[in-house]
């Protein structure tokens, strides 16, 4: 199943995806689309890159804020709405016959929590990484995005969850 990421309405969602350019600097085209990865290309493309830069974006809310030139093609969706919920496909179009890497990730957008006892930490958690993860084929990207907390592994998230629960914060 897809890795699941949760973001609150009005916040930024971060959907990780990366590859290792080989050799370094040898970039490959990538597309992000809404909907699971089809047979080739992406469905309902929201952003495309070529061998040099982003060359197609359907909205100004879609950004690659990581180090694109090092293979970090994680998607940031700014100011998310409930309509942004769904499965997204990150397709790394490695040259060759059927060589593509396909990564499906699920974004769940929720209405803001009514009670947030630890507002700063809660806000950062919402925008930086999922509050609920399931095991998937593609883990969090290694690079940080500006203004976000570092990516953490599942153990760290569960530890953080327990700490927040002890402090009275709500974790879904």
């Amino acid at each position: 199943s897809e890795v699941e990421y949760i973001a609150e309405v009005g916040q930024n969602a971060y959907l990780p995806c990366s590859y290792t350019p080989a050799p370094p600097g040898n970039l490959v085209p990538v597309c992000w689309g809404k909907g699971a990865c089809p047979v080739f290309d992406c469905s309902n493309v929201v952003l495309r890159t070529d061998n040099r830069d982003v060359n197609d974006r359907t909205s100004g809310r879609y950004w690659l804020k990581g180090d694109f030139h090092k293979g970090d093609v994680s998607l940031t969706i700014e100011n998310v709405t409930l309509a942004d919920s769904g499965v997204y496909c990150c397709r790394i179009q490695i040259p060759g016959i059927m060589n593509d890497e396909k990564h499906n990730v699920k974004l769940v957008v929720i209405k803001p929590a009514k009670v947030t006892p630890a507002p700063t930490l809660q806000r950062d958690l919402t925008s930086a990484f999922p509050r609920m993860l399931t095991t998937g084929e593609h883990g969090p990207a290694e690079t940080q995005t500006p203004g976000s907390l570092p990516d953490v592994n599942l153990t760290q998230i569960f530890t953080l969850t327990n700490e927040l629960r002890d402090s009275g914060a709500t974790i879904r």
Epitope: V28, G35, S43, V45, G96, M98
Partner: antibody, heavy 120, light 107 residues
Framework: EVQLVESGGGLVQPGGSLRLSCAAS????????WSWVRRAPGKGLEWVSA????????YYADSVKGRFTISRDNSKNTLYLQMNSLRAEDTAVYYC?????????????WGQGTLVTVSS | EIVLTQSPATLSLSPGERATLSCRAS??????LAWYQQKPGQAPRLLIY???NRATGIPASFSGSGSGTDFTLTISRLEPEDFAVYYC?????????FGGGTKVEIK
Amino acid sequence: EVQLVESGGGLVQPGGSLRLSCAASGFTFRQNAWSWVRRAPGKGLEWVSAISGSGGSTYYADSVKGRFTISRDNSKNTLYLQMNSLRAEDTAVYYCAKGGDYGGNYFDYWGQGTLVTVSS
Amino acid sequence: EIVLTQSPATLSLSPGERATLSCRASQSVSSYLAWYQQKPGQAPRLLIYDASNRATGIPASFSGSGSGTDFTLTISRLEPEDFAVYYCQQYGSSPLTFGGGTKVEIK
């Protein structure tokens, strides 16, 4: 207006080769994935091959893998299909087809087709 | 590969009648299904994509529905120019496959 014009079809003997071309006009060629689809006499449609917008990634049906090669020249707005080791069962009308503007592997524009006949 | 079965193979109707065409997939394709119309000597024409979205320029009399394995193309009122062969196509799983077609003929 979108226009797709195929050429290069004809009669060829089994084991022979042909190169099909599809000249496109009326839109931005490079952004879309492209495919070749064929229709054999008295049969339905069969997807043959596809190529990504960049031209780097290619996809084939098992029936043609290793024999057919799809390519594109974005500077010429042209799609190609190099067909080698042709067999009688490759006899069909070959269509080039443009992938949807926002991705998706459906085809929103098709050429009129070019007939390939493989016979001795 | 995913097999698409279209039924009926032939549909005999009169102009003004409603046509209901079925396409069944051997396994789920989510909503990744398209419908095409083809007339003799012509290229296929996209009618519906993503199971229910009408393509540009397609009349409102054409509608698509379904998801998973069962899909339907409905022509609410047949016009003389609607008599043709209709194909469904899935793009949820490699390779892309088409159904065998349904011929809508004049009764």
